[in-house]
């Protein structure tokens, strides 16, 4: 005899208004007598409708939540399935139900922002900045919204960059316990004469810093030939350990660069009568805090005032 | 009694493969969930992969999705992981472990002693 | 990913004190909670599953409790037997599996 199980009933997705973080939630399926001591586990899988593959998990819970881009449109689809232990060693599961979020088409997409950019400068307060859309009318304004767990609710943007009289970005600052976890943007828009899309954006912080350059550069050289090269890791909230460095080195017409993680770099100079050492450095978030990152702009330029020509007293 | 016997642990270089076995005997091998746990030296347990009791659903830890595979034999009662492109932050004592109902991850009611993976150049 | 806060990291007790180790998920994880004991160069030990069901063989001085997202784990009159490291694990959706990072027991 086949044994048999029930899908989960009522699968739905829904869209609390956390701009992209969506509840995926269901009711137990209606269980038959001999199955009521079983633990009853649940397949879920779900994506964006424009992606290849399914996101996959195994959860006894009746939701799950998760981050999605709601400029495009969601499917989800949900089983059953009951252990060996329950069927005599048989995997049974019910077949597959299956949900959908539309996104809404609101608005042509040519009314959509534009070219949008964030930037959570040295790890301290997040700049975000968006063009109009292609065809708007001159009475367009843009207004944005985010949300990221911890936050009771969507906020909006308190302190908008202005141009022309219409807001085209957002500073935040004092975004506590806001990184290391999705950060949802919604930027949407208002005019008397059409309706405006809204876009949506996603992002995680810790990989989208701007550090700030390193600073007190020093060059010396030892023994003639030994350059031993350091700086200070910029003021900031960023631990030390987290940089990694990028280091031009010139002397006279010839310059190469380096890489490290530490503060500091020893090597050896190309030609013992160069009469121009110098130096300047830039760095970023390393792999070790962050998956992403924005090299800082470079220092300024040191250079070794140790040379003596042949003119010199 | 439940035992649950490990082997196949050993030194590796960088980028080598090895293949763990998991000797299982004392409950009904194919009625039974079974996973891999692995716990680098001096540092906590963390989750590998599980397999369903038919073989037939198998689950992993993004930090080895696509590098490990999980298998068994029912009719010889053994599981396996097979461990490619290995790195040196996959050095640990890998543990099977069996789950204590459940389709694929659960509580864990049976340990092996554990096998140690080094990879070392 | 579901993450497992243990709380303390390290407890110096003495022989006959009550011991409570705390752990907190990050979301609701029902009563889908198991706790393990394990000891140097040993494999863990499952003392509780299901928040609060006691694992044949494991002493009555242990006890687990709570649901939702606070779960607590407790030896009634610690035993020298009872001095080893114990981890939380969520069992609730996978994957990933997740532990806690474990609590060290330790003679005061």
């Known amino acids: 005899l086949e044994i048999k199980v029930n899908p989960p009933q009522d699968f739905e997705i829904l869209d609390p208004g956390l701009l992209g973080y969506l509840y995926l939630q269901w009711k137990p399926p209606v269980v038959i007598e001999k199955f009521k001591g079983c633990t009853l586990e649940y397949e879920l899988k779900y994506r964006n409708v424009d992606s290849d593959s399914w996101k996959t998990i195994i959860t006894r819970n009746l939701i799950y939540k998760d981050g999605f881009d709601l400029n495009k449109g969601i499917e989800g689809k949900i089983r059953t399935h009951l252990s060996e232990h329950c069927t005599n060693g048989s995997e049974v599961q019910s077949p597959w139900i299956e949900a959908s979020y539309g996104i809404s088409d609101e608005g042509s997409l040519e009314t959509k922002i534009q070219d949008m950019k964030c930037i959570y400068y040295n790890w301290q307060y997040l700049v975000c900045s968006w063009k109009p859309g292609k065809t708007v009318y001159s009475d367009t304004n843009y207004t944005m919204f985010f949300w990221y767990e911890g936050l009771d609710h969507a906020l909006q943007c308190a302190d908008y960059l202005q141009h022309d009289e219409k807001n085209v970005g957002c500073k935040l600052s004092n975004l506590d316990s806001s990184d290391y976890k999705d950060f949802f943007i919604c930027v949407n828009g208002s005019s008397k004469l059409e309706p405006i899309r809204s876009s949506y954006t996603v992002f995680q912080l810790q990989n989208i810093v701007k550090p700030l350059p390193p600073e007190f550069l020093h060059i010396s050289v030892e023994n003639s030939i030994d350059i031993r090269m350091k700086w200070s890791t910029p003021g900031g909230p960023i631990p030390p350990r987290c940089y990694t460095y990028e280091i031009v080195i010139r002397e006279d017409d010839i310059s190469w660069e380096s890489a490290t993680d530490k503060n500091d770099m020893k090597l050896k100079r190309r030609a013992n009568e160069s009469e121009d050492l110098c130096f300047f450095v830039r760095c970023k978030v390393n792999i070790y805090c962050a998956d992403d990152g924005i090299w800082s702009e470079w220092s300024e330029e040191e250079c070794w005032e140790g040379y003596t020509g042949p003119d010199s007293k | 009694e439940v035992q649950l016997l490990e082997s196949g642990g050993g030194l590796v270089q960088p980028g080598g493969s090895l293949r763990l076995s998991c000797a299982a005997s004392?409950?009904?091998?194919?009625?039974?969930?079974l996973n891999w746990v692995r716990q680098a030296p001096g540092k906590g347990l963390e989750w590998v992969s599980a397999?369903?009791?038919?073989?037939?659903?198998?689950f992993y830890a993004d930090s080895v999705k696509g590098r490990f595979t999980i298998s068994r034999d029912n009719s010889k009662n053994t599981l396996y992981l097979q461990m490619n492109s290995l790195r040196a932050e996959d050095t640990a004592v890998y543990y099977c472990?069996?789950?204590?109902?459940?389709w694929g991850a659960g509580a864990f009611d049976y340990w092996g002693q554990g096998t140690l993976v080094t990879v070392s150049s | 990913d579901i993450q497992m806060t243990q709380s303390p990291s390290t407890l110096s007790a003495s022989v006959g004190d009550r011991v409570t180790i705390t752990c907190r998920a990050s979301?609701?994880?029902?009563?889908?909670l198991a706790w393990y004991q394990q000891k140097p160069g040993k494999a863990p030990k499952l003392l509780i599953y299901?928040?609060?069901s006691l694992e044949s063989g494991v002493p009555s001085r242990f006890s687990g409790s709570g649901s939702g997202t606070e779960f607590t784990l407790t030896i009634s009159s610690l035993q020298p037997d009872d001095f080893a490291t114990y981890y939380c694990?969520?069992?609730?959706?996978?994957?990933?599996?997740?532990f806690g990072q474990g609590t060290k027991v330790e003679i005061k």
């Open positions: 472990a069996k789950v204590r109902y459940g």
């Open positions: 004392g409950f009904t091998f194919s009625r039974d969930a």
């Open positions: 397999i369903s009791g038919s073989g037939g659903s198998t």
């Open positions: 979301q609701s994880i029902s009563s889908w």
């Open positions: 299901d928040a609060s």
């Open positions: 694990q969520q069992y609730d959706t996978y994957p990933p599996i997740t």
